[in-house]
């Protein structure tokens, strides 16, 4: 049967791909086959043959970026160290060994699901602009985060969350396969505004909040506050 | 894609003989290495392999077939044969070809739909 796993690793950071025999296995490398390919595509991470040595067949995503120990797999340790974690490595990678002794059963059969997550920069709300007399409009931005975001804008008087229809959000992807968004929320114009842009990002359970506030005898300023959700309500009491 | 297609399942007495083929539908490049076996499957009990045989001649044999069954390939014509003798009720099951690509990687496989192998007393 196949083990399942899953493991969150940050863009730019190494990770470990877990998969391994339980602990005084021992393997004669003349005798294992052991691939590391994703689950759909199909595609080569890296791979032991016996009298084999070259690794021309790795795809060239994976190529000098995805090791496996020699000394490890001895032991049954088949894991796999990926290097500069990417967007594009978020799937589902197979770990695959077989014993050529024993007919080529594999012996070993691991399915690693790797998530990927960067911190969005904090976001950047700009002066409220007024395109009518009753409008005002704000535009907050962030950039360079994992997965897609949620966008939340928040009325800072209550804490309550205003309501989506007002606001108008676009995603993109960006050069590095990072996601940057800008929201740009419409209000109707009132004497005091006090609000805040809020982006979520839920696999790091990590809010950035920005508030900006506007008034007849008080400029706008800014406020920042990075909070860690503990609970999975989604922004539940996490904006000051 | 390659296709398995397998012949020769059928209902037999114990102690009788059948003789299982199974044909590739293309073959692996003649620098690959594949291993071509026969699996089965009885109800409520997962899939084991019978016996194998690999490109490169290497065979195997479950310990419960050792010395009844013999496996062969004729790589020109990407066939496998299951010759099996002296058939007890326990080989009752469905039998599965199987084509396994060791090299080039990635590792693929490729199953047969499966005959029925029935041994009664």
């Known amino acids: 049967d196949t083990q399942e796993k899953e493991v969150r690793a940050m863009v730019g950071s190494d990770v470990e791909l877990s998969c391994a025999c339980p602990e005084g296995s021992r393997f004669d490398l003349n005798d294992v086959y052991v691939y590391w390919q994703t689950s759909e595509s199909k595609t080569v991470v890296t791979y032991h043959i016996p009298q084999n040595s070259s690794l021309e067949n790795v795809d060239s995503r994976y190529r000098n970026r995805a090791l496996m120990s020699p000394a490890g797999m001895l032991r049954g340790d088949f894991s796999l160290r990926l290097f500069n974690v990417t967007p594009q490595d978020e799937q589902k990678f197979h770990c695959l060994v077989l014993s050529q002794s024993l007919g080529f059963q594999e012996v070993l059969s691991v399915e690693v699901t790797l998530h990927v997550a960067a911190n969005f920069s904090v976001p950047v709300v700009s002066a409220p602009h007024s395109p009518s007399q009753d409008e005002l409009t704000f535009t907050c931005t962030s950039i360079n985060g994992y997965p897609r975001p949620n966008v939340y804008w928040i009325n800072k008087t209550d804490n309550s969350l205003l309501d989506q229809a007002l606001q108008n959000d676009t995603v993109f992807l960006n050069m590095r396969g990072l996601y940057d968004v800008v929201s740009v929320l419409r209000i109707a114009r009132t004497p005091s505004v006090n609000i805040g842009c809020c982006i979520e990002n839920v696999l790091l359970q990590q809010n950035l909040t920005v508030g900006s506030q506007t008034g007849n005898d008080i400029g706008e300023r800014d406020k920042i506050t990075e909070n860690p959700v503990s609970t999975g309500e989604k922004n539940a009491a996490t904006w000051s | 894609e390659v296709q398995l297609v397998e012949s020769g399942g059928g209902l037999v007495q114990t102690g009788g003989s059948l003789r299982l083929s199974c044909a590739a539908s293309?073959?692996?490049?003649?620098?690959?290495?594949?291993?071509m076996g026969w699996y089965r499957q009885s109800p409520g009990k997962q899939r084991e392999l019978v016996a194998s045989i690999s490109s490169f001649g290497s065979t195997y044999y479950a310990d419960s077939v050792k010395g009844r069954f013999i496996i062969s390939r004729d790589n020109a014509k990407n066939t496998v044969n299951l010759q099996m003798n002296n058939l007890k009720l326990e080989d009752t099951a469905v039998h599965f070809c199987?084509?396994?690509?060791?090299?080039?990687?990635?590792?693929?496989?490729?199953w047969g739909q499966g005959t029925q192998v029935t041994v009664s007393s």
């Open positions: 199987n084509l396994r690509r060791l090299s080039p990687p990635p590792l693929l496989d490729y």
């Open positions: 293309s073959s692996t490049s003649t620098s690959s290495i594949d291993v």
